[in-house]
Interface confidence: medium
């Protein structure tokens, strides 16, 4: 995730780890993988020294991924002291909020919303209907709840994975003349 121009928590009274982690994967950055399932998993956040929840896509990723909070703590958290304050990190926003708008390659034209890290606001864009990334919300409200307001549990994220019906621009895609024009 990009970290420019974002609000940060202050760095105060940070102690270094007592020792190197037993498992090197504890220091790996969270990786949700390229697939698009919606699976709750836990990872060890090297910045906060805590086990945290994330949504795993269901394939690939890395070893910093645990089925339970307890397993994560057992493997990683015991090697680190509790921190009196958190290290600098982006407050509450999922990583994908900092991805650029990505219409994908397809040529359906669907109104979606994305979080613009420059303006710090959710804005409308045209989504092509396939590929793209997770900074893609069906409603302005969902975008704001997830990315502008610091997120929380990320309710409604499942909707991101649901397909949206493609609506054609009037006249259809470029350089095609339709013999008949179809609207879903």
């Amino acid at each position: 995730a990009a970290e420019e121009d974002e609000e940060f928590t202050n760095i105060t009274d940070i102690k270094p780890p007592l020792q190197k982690p037993t498992h090197s994967f504890c220091a790996m950055k969270v990786d949700d993988g390229p697939c698009r399932a919606y699976i709750k998993r836990f990872f060890f956040n090297i910045l906060t020294h805590q086990c945290e929840e994330f949504i795993y896509g269901g394939c690939e990723g890395n070893e910093n991924r645990f089925e339970s909070l307890e397993e994560c703590k057992e493997k990683c958290a015991r090697d680190y002291p509790k921190m009196t304050t958190k290290l600098t990190f982006q407050k509450g926003k999922p990583d994908f909020c900092f991805l650029e708008e990505d219409p994908g390659i397809c040529r359906g034209y669907i109104t979606r919303y994305f979080y613009n890290n420059q303006s710090k606001q959710c804005e409308r864009f045209k989504y092509g209907g396939c590929l793209g990334n997770l900074n893609n919300f069906e409603s302005l409200e969902e975008c704001k709840n997830t990315c502008e307001n610091g997120g929380g549990s990320g309710g409604g994220l499942n909707d991101i994975f649901e397909a949206q019906k493609i609506e054609w621009h009037e006249g259809g895609p470029p350089h095609h003349h339709h013999h008949h024009h179809h609207h879903h």
Partner: antibody, heavy 118, light 113 residues
């Protein structure tokens, strides 16, 4: 008239590299996403990779992720596919195609054959 | 194995109507993603026949039509002609994979006689 002409195919040993090119004409190249689709001898079609019109977004099939890199030079109206760590199963005719309508590829090149064999 | 399932082969006599099926799942056709159809004549590149479920690009005869319902799609060819002998592929998008554009395995259509 839209034309897509692939080049760069040939025989390469397993583990080797090749760079395919696709020269485009007859349409505003930078306005269109482009894809590579391949077809193994006697087999069906398989999507390989895609790139947005600006080149800012790229996408790959799992089978080539980490080994192939798609790119484009809009000033030259040319699409590229850099293929590294080639395997026997990458042997195929590679087509470039433009994403015109919806999720469709509406114009295709004639294809270039890549053979990976020792 | 292909994500979309098509019959490997079909045949029909000239003038007949044939239908090629394409069966998907809840993560592609059933998720309301559009289906495309391509025709590949022997030794040539694929050609777009139908896009957006039932739209024909200019130049494609109206003998070709497409439809999609639920997790299935079909391509209908009426008034079958000798030059329709080719491989036909359905294609869509699958959200359960790594953002993959997916194809059916192809159907070899033979025009009898």
């Amino acid at each position: 008239e839209v034309q897509l002409v692939e080049s760069g195919g040939g025989l390469v040993q397993p583990g080797g590299s090749l760079r395919l090119s696709c020269a485009a004409s007859g349409f505003t190249f930078s306005s269109y996403a482009m894809s590579w689709v391949r077809q193994a001898p006697g087999k069906g079609l398989e999507w390989v990779s895609a790139i947005s019109g600006s080149g800012g977004s790229t996408y790959y099939a799992d089978s080539v992720k980490g080994r192939f890199t798609i790119s484009r030079d809009n000033s030259k109206n040319t699409l590229y596919l850099q293929m590294n760590s080639l395997r026997a199963e990458d042997t195929a005719v590679y087509y470039c195609a433009n994403n015109g309508a919806a999720a469709a590829w509406d114009y295709w090149g004639q294809g270039t054959l890549v053979t990976v064999s020792s | 194995q292909s994500v979309l399932t098509q019959p490997p082969s079909l045949s029909g006599a000239p003038g007949q109507r044939v239908t090629i099926s394409c069966t998907g799942s809840s993560s592609n056709l059933g998720a309301d993603y559009d289906v495309q159809w391509y025709q590949q004549l022997p030794g040539t590149a694929p050609k777009l026949l139908i896009f957006g479920n039932n739209n024909r690009p200019s130049g494609v005869p109206d003998r070709f039509s497409g439809s999609r319902s639920g997790t299935s799609a079909s391509l209908a060819i009426t008034g079958l002609q000798a030059e329709d002998e080719a491989n036909y592929y359905c294609q869509s998008y699958d959200r359960s994979l790594s953002g993959s554009m997916v194809f059916g395995g192809g159907t070899k259509l033979t025009v009898l006689g």
